[in-house]
């Protein structure tokens, strides 16, 4: 036999106390699927949260964060304070990035500057608290007689002659 509750559409609940009739979810509650025996209470976006999408009888409200904060966690379960570029959020608040590190966003942690020498390159533009270094051509490419504009020709495999 088919469960009578399976006929209850989203936006209703199957009321066991009323011979399994389909009752509408009360205001500020929802059921996103059919055949539900309860309605879920709508999320309320309060305080630092603000409403991105209103609750309806078939879907929950969605929250985001008020300016100066950003979402963390699934479904924006938390709001975390923004910092300025060049800073990171610590337990004591926003702190400037240490020398040798940078953060180009209002969230997240300070990351070390790229080590250009690991790629055999030179530093073209120094890093700051807000920006990573810009690596330039390798020092060999900048030796006298070498063009700093024309990139070196790609290496050819043995046995291939230029066209």
């Amino acid at each position: 036999l088919q469960d009578p509750c399976s006929n209850c559409p989203a936006g209703t609940f199957c009321d066991n106390n009323r011979n399994q009739i389909c009752s509408p979810c009360p205001p500020n509650s929802f059921s996103s699927a059919g055949g539900q025996r309860t309605c879920d209470i709508c999320r309320q976006c309060k305080g630092v949260f603000r409403t991105r999408k209103e609750c309806s009888s078939t879907s929950n409200a969605e929250c985001d964060c008020t300016p100066g904060f950003h979402c963390l966690g699934a479904g924006c379960s938390m709001c975390e304070q923004d910092c300025k570029q060049g800073q990171e959020l610590t337990k004591k608040g926003c702190k400037d990035c240490c020398f040798g590190t940078f953060n180009d966003q209002k969230r997240g942690i300070c990351r070390p500057w790229t080590n250009c020498s690991l790629d055999g390159k030179s530093v073209l533009v120094n890093g700051t608290k807000e920006r990573d270094v810009v690596c330039g051509p390798s020092p060999a490419d900048l030796s006298p007689g070498a063009s700093s504009v024309t990139p070196p020709a790609p290496a050819r495999e043995p046995g291939h002659s230029p066209q």
Epitope: P26, P27, S29, I41
Partner: nanobody
Framework: EVQLLESGGGLVQPGGSLRLSCAAS????????VGWFRQAPGKELQYVGT??????HYGDFENNRFTISRDNSKNTVYLQMNSLRAEDTAVYYC???????????????QGQGTLVTVSS
């Protein structure tokens, strides 16, 4: 920590009335459905009703004798019980949940209960 405190229970004669209160501390009722349950001596927990957002849902036994209401300013939900009978004797509990009605769900928080005795 959420705490629910029931009050208003006591001894009442058959046919009499009582109003039970459920007050929350540590959290407002704003985003919760509030339910009432009862447990008679030697019996299992029985669903009385749920209040949420101006709507009340009731168990199938009480036959319009019970009414659930709420006072937002006092963060309190009430259970008004009229025409009381001996079989209404029980410990009455309030509870909160993120679901409506609470007839088929386990509460998120439940109080300690208040005893109602209906006897002549």
């Amino acid at each position: 920590e959420v705490q629910l405190l029931e009050s208003g229970g006591g001894l009442v004669q058959p046919g009499g009335s009582l109003r039970l209160s459920c007050a929350a501390s540590g959290r407002t009722f704003d985003n919760y459905a509030v339910g009432w349950f009862r447990q008679a001596p030697g019996k299992e927990l029985q669903y009385v009703g749920t209040y949420w957002s101006g709507y009340a849902h009731y168990g199938d036994f009480e036959n319009n004798r019970f009414t659930i209401s709420r006072d937002n300013s006092k963060n309190t939900v009430y259970l008004q019980m009229n025409s009381l009978r001996a079989e209404d004797t029980a410990v009455y509990y309030c509870a909160i949940s993120l679901k409506y009605p609470m007839a088929t769900v386990t509460p998120d928080y439940q109080g300690q209960g208040t005893l109602v005795t209906v006897s002549s």
